[in-house]
């Protein structure tokens, strides 16, 4: 039960990529507004997105304080013109979100190939170390900073003239691969956290091919 003309939020869903984290829910409000609260399992509730008509709330600033914590959010529904009004139990109608542990669950954003350099029959491919919104000592940490040894990259590469793909893996942000002399290759990378059970892999990066601007070729 709740206040007349208010309905509880439902379908509370966490949308999170590289720790940018938004809670979404339904329904679109009709004559009601929402307030969101977030808490760790052992912490106090903190209110965000006060009396909003949106059906999403950016909770990034809260979860980046400790991405290894497990968070719970709840969405309160209030009548649009009377936010002091409460339900029959003496408090506004609300719905709980699923639990969310950013470190284990945030989606890995699409990586970018920063550069590639050919020296003879070797090519060094470097993946951009993407910045996250996690901070330490007032600086933003990179994806590698945050995930450390848990993060690997998979490189897919193939001759421009064929479709047969090869793969390589690295626990850094660099690959050194052998290529055939005189052949042009294309590259795509994927971020992977092998230890995860969900959201283990990012989408593939945009394809970059030799003979285009991003790379460098040196004949030794």
């Amino acid at each position: 039960s709740g206040t007349t003309n208010t309905v509880a939020a439902y379908n509370l869903t966490w949308k999170s990529t590289n720790f940018k984290t938004i809670l979404e829910w339904e329904p679109k409000p009709v004559n009601q507004v929402y307030t969101v609260q977030i808490s760790t399992k052992s912490g106090d509730w903190k209110s965000k997105c006060f009396y909003t008509t949106d059906t999403e709330c950016d909770l990034t600033d809260e979860i980046v304080k400790d991405v290894k914590q497990t968070y719970l959010a709840r969405v309160f529904s209030y009548p649009a013109g009377n936010v002091e009004s409460t339900g029959s139990a003496g408090e506004p109608l609300y719905e709980n979100s699923p639990e969310f542990t950013p470190y284990l669950e945030t989606n890995l954003g699409q990586p970018t190939i920063q550069s590639f350099e050919q020296v003879g029959t070797k090519v060094n491919v470097t993946v951009e170390d993407e910045r996250t919104l996690v901070r330490r000592n007032n600086t933003f940490l990179s994806l590698r900073d945050v995930f450390g040894k848990d993060l690997i990259y998979t490189l897919y590469y193939w001759k421009s003239s064929s479709s047969g793909k090869k793969t390589a893996k690295t626990n850094t942000n660099e690959f050194l691969i052998d290529v055939d002399k005189g052949e042009n290759y294309c590259f795509s990378v994927q971020a992977v956290i092998p230890s995860r059970t969900v959201n283990r892999k990012s989408t593939d990066s945009p394809v970059e091919c030799m003979g285009q601007e991003k790379g460098e070729f040196r004949e030794i």
Epitope: K68, R136, V146, G148, K149, R196
Partner: antibody, heavy 121, light 109 residues
Framework: EVQLQQSGAEVMKPGASVKISCKAS????????IEWVKQAPGQGLEWIGE????????KYNEKFKGRVTFTADTSTNTAYMELSSLRSEDTAVYYC??????????????WGQGTLVTVSS | QAVVTQEPSLTVSPGGTVTLTCRSS?????????ANWVQQKPGQLPKGLIS???NRGPWTTARFSGSILGDKAVLTLWGAHTEDEAVYYC?????????FGGGTKLTVL
């Protein structure tokens, strides 16, 4: 406050199995790797392997593969190490450990008090 | 499997500075090895000093500092105290496993 509390000493016969527990408190158990480390009498530290409780993902030192199994119970915040086919050279103190995480960091910051396993006929 | 090598023993005078090194048999130590330094005093439990190359634990005095110097990981201790006498272990990460060095017995004399 992060704490790792291990089970008590065990005296085992050769060929038997032993299961050691490591109960964690003061942090989100599922998100941190638990490391297992062996220290034989008068010897240095030797890494046995690790488990990430939230996903049950494990990694093992090749030397112990096949004889050691890690499990974790997230409902009780407890990690377990089972070592089978015990022999005299398994006599050692076994530690669980966890890293200190401040945005990024990995390894062996917090340690349990150790469990002495003695293998003797 | 890689071998991690440390000086078996070092001696430092009280108030002095000492550098402990950690070498890898596979080549240069990098930040991807996430070097750890663990202190173990006689008859005591191990205690983590540094993890992830240079991250001090909240209990680690600022007299200890971790870094990479050239091709090795180093632990530098400034202003040594007698209570710093211990065995110091280095551990390095290799893609899917940790390897501990044999330890350096540090004497403050």
């Amino acid at each position: 406050e992060v704490q790792l509390q291990q089970s008590g000493a065990e005296v085992m016969k050769p060929g038997a199995s032993v299961k050691i527990s490591c109960k964690a408190s003061g942090y989100t158990f599922s998100s941190y790797w638990i490391e297992w480390v062996k220290q034989a009498p008068g010897q240095g530290l030797e890494w046995i392997g690790e488990i990430l409780p939230g996903s049950a993902s494990t990694k093992y030192n090749e030397k112990f593969k096949g004889r050691v199994t890690f499990t974790a119970d997230t409902s009780t915040n407890t990690a377990y190490m089972e070592l089978s086919s015990l022999r005299s050279e398994d006599t050692a103190v076994y530690y669980c450990a966890r890293d200190y995480y401040y945005g990024s960091s990995y390894g062996f910051a917090y340690w349990g008090q150790g469990t002495l396993v003695t293998v003797s006929s | 499997q890689a071998v991690v090598t440390q000086e078996p023993s070092l001696t430092v005078s009280p108030g002095g500075t000492v550098t402990l090194t950690c070498r890898s048999s596979t080549g240069a130590v990098t930040t991807s090895n996430y070097a750890n330094w663990v202190q173990q005093k006689p008859g005591q439990l191990p205690k983590g000093l540094i993890s992830g190359t240079n991250n001090r634990g909240p209990w680690t005095t600022a007299r200890f500092s971790g870094s990479i110097l050239g091709d090795k990981a180093v632990l530098t201790l400034w202003g040594a105290h007698t209570e710093d006498e211990a065995v110091y272990y280095c551990a390095l990460w290799y893609s899917n496993h940790w390897v501990f060095g044999g330890g350096t017995k540090l004497t403050v004399l």
